[in-house]
């Protein structure tokens, strides 16, 4: 599994699209990283 920052972004984007743009306050990303690094 992807274990760094961009993966978080992609998962969050998917979550946003599935939830109509609302993210629960208790949403904490899993252990993943960023393509911007």
């Amino acid at each position: 599994a992807c274990d760094t920052a961009t993966c978080v972004t992609h998962r969050l984007a998917g979550l946003l699209s599935r939830s109509g743009g609302v993210v629960k306050n208790n949403f904490v990303p899993t252990n993943v990283g960023s393509k911007a690094f």
């Epitope: 760094t4 984007a13 990303p29 252990n31 990283g33 393509k35 911007a36």
Partner: antibody, heavy 122, light 107 residues
Framework: EVQLVESGGGLVQPGGSLRLSCAAS????????ISWVRQAPGKGLEWVAE??????????HYAEAVKGRFTISRDNAKNSLYLQMNSLRAEDTAVYYC?????????????WGQGTLVTVSS | EIVLTQSPATLSLSPGERATLSCKAS??????VSWYQQKPGQAPRLLIY???NRYLGIPARFSGSGSGTDFTLTISSLEPEDFAVYYC?????????FGQGTKLEIK
């Protein structure tokens, strides 16, 4: 204009402590993930630690070589990043860079400071 | 830890020539690879992210390709300012890691 200014480097004896700072300006600091990356004289780049944004619970990750000795932290109100370095060793001698990055869709951003030199020697 | 192996260690070329730099990962990293350029006394500069995307302001002569474990940075026609050290990095797994670097020098 984006600016990142590291400070706090210097000469320290083995076993000593040092606290590095990175002052940021020109962008929304709290949105960014931040890493410290170091480079020993004449050597390659080595990732040291990362702290995520406030919205990501400011989660931290560390390289094995510094785990338990170094602590990364941030103060979003002061637009500042810190690296507390304890139990310093000769092999920690390096230029330390702060690196800020933001990744959302096409909004990729990546900023480096100019670096601050840490020398561990007796 | 994912090990990135860059080759060659040193590449000697002339301005106008094409440069091809390789980066091989010890494990699959999908496209979570970036390429950096570093000149003496300066901080690294991001060139390519996501294996093939040029960062803001990076000239079109720089391109990246690859996925999985094999990655390539290509500079189509070298300019005098391109002679520097190039590093690949991966951000697919912690710890983030860098390759050992390829020094691109003037022939």
């Amino acid at each position: 204009e984006v600016q990142l200014v590291e400070s706090g480097g210097g000469l320290v004896q083995p076993g000593g402590s040092l606290r590095l700072s990175c002052a940021a300006s020109g962008f929304t600091f709290s949105n960014y993930w931040i890493s410290w990356v170091r480079q020993a004289p004449g050597k390659g780049l080595e990732w040291v630690a990362e702290i995520r944004s406030e919205s990501d619970a400011s989660a931290t990750h560390y390289a094995e070589a510094v785990k338990g000795r170094f602590t990364i932290s941030r103060d979003n109100a002061k637009n500042s990043l810190y690296l507390q370095m304890n139990s310093l060793r000769a092999e920690d001698t390096a230029v330390y860079y702060c690196l800020l990055y933001f990744d959302y869709g096409l909004a990729i951003q990546n900023y480096w400071g100019q670096g601050t030199l840490v020398t561990v020697s007796s | 830890e994912i090990v990135l192996t860059q080759s060659p260690a040193t590449l000697s070329l002339s301005p106008g020539e094409r440069a091809t730099l390789s980066c091989k990962a010890s494990k699959r990293v999908t496209t979570y690879v970036s390429w950096y350029q570093q000149k003496p006394g300066q901080a690294p500069r991001l060139l390519i992210y996501g294996a093939s995307n040029r960062y803001l302001g990076i000239p079109a002569r720089f391109s990246g390709s690859g996925s999985g474990t094999d990655f390539t940075l290509t500079i189509s026609s070298l300019e005098p300012e391109d002679f520097a050290v190039y590093y690949c990095s991966q951000s697919y797994n912690y710890p983030y890691t860098f390759g050992q670097g390829t020094k691109l020098e003037i022939k």
